[in-house]
Amino acid sequence: ESGYAQNGDLEDAELDDYSFSCYSQLEVNGSQHSLTCAFEDPDVNITNLEFEICGALVEVKCLNFRKLQEIYFIETKKFLLIGKSNICVKVGEKSLTCKKIDLTTIVKPEAPFDLSVVYREGANDFVVTFNTSHLQKKYVKVLMHDVAYRQEKDENKWTHVNLSSTKLTLLQRKLQPAAMYEIKVRSIPDHYFKGFWSEWSPSYYFRTPEINNSSGEMDPI
């Protein structure tokens, strides 16, 4: 007979699906790393549920997560970043479900920032530049970036360009004249580390010049 038979809450809990997903962010706060997890079912009752990570840690055997609303997270310098850690959902001392995960394979980079677009009249093009905090990091330095742009009126018609640098040139003739464009960028690990796309950068908005009727070229803005 189960030692938990008297506990109605736990009996119900054992019928639930405790599947969860996580991502890591390395050197997200100085030399501190973070690990963020959430249940895949947003409706799981998380009242008494905790997350714990054990293994592939420096100086300690296990660490407990902090809870914020429906997410669980750790910020620490103690990730070894070699080998797999065991991440468990727990009620008290009882583990409900566990996953063995190598934190270097679930990396989510920080979002790029300082996105801007400059029109070059003589070259008839737009130079897109942005920044990423990963240029200064020790671990996740090499990223692939996804620049997406669209005419503002075309809700879901995004054009995507993948690049490894933080500079892109868009030819004026490939864009509609006298139109408002939205552009944004995100990043994903591209060397040794594996994982997920970052959040999108804040969008940048720019207007393309009018067409100069006499020459068929666009007027500068």
Epitope: T36, A38, L68, Q69, E70, I71, E199
Partner: nanobody, 121 residues
Framework: QVQLVESGGGSVQPGGSLRLSCATS????????MTWYRQGPGKTRELVAV???????TYADSVKGRFTISRDNAKNTMDLQMNGLKPEDTAVYYC???WGGGLNREPFDYWGQGTQVTVSS
């Protein structure tokens, strides 16, 4: 569909202050990034301030030291305290809440309708 509602706009003299608020009509995933944008007369929409779930903030150069963004994750709200307002701050201010996807949550990108801020003597 989640609705974002901005409030707190109005008219103020140069040097004055306003506090904008953005409230959601539904539950927003706590990891979402919250952003204020603005669009001045005859201008393109521009970033004003960003706050991540961790509370990390970023500001446009033009508002640094004058504007402060904050959020309350428990209430799914975001505020923008605007001090030392200048005529060039005149614009419609929009709040935006964005999640790029992952952790089994679908991506979303919600916008408010905007609130007018006018700075004039």
């Amino acid at each position: 569909q989640v609705q974002l509602v901005e409030s707190g706009g109005g008219s103020v003299q140069p040097g004055g202050s306003l506090r904008l608020s953005c409230a959601t009509s539904g539950s927003i995933f706590s990891l979402a990034t919250m952003t204020w944008y603005r669009q001045g007369p005859g201008k393109t929409r521009e970033l004003v301030a960003v706050i991540t779930w961790r509370g990390t903030t970023t500001y446009a150069d033009s508002v640094k030291g004058r504007f402060t963004i904050s959020r309350d994750n428990a209430k799914n709200t975001m505020d923008l305290q605007m001090n030392g307002l200048k005529p060039e701050d005149t614009a419609v201010y929009y709040c935006n809440v964005k999640w790029g996807g992952g952790l089994n949550r679908e991506p979303f990108d919600y916008w408010g309708q905007g609130t007018q801020v006018t700075v004039s003597s």
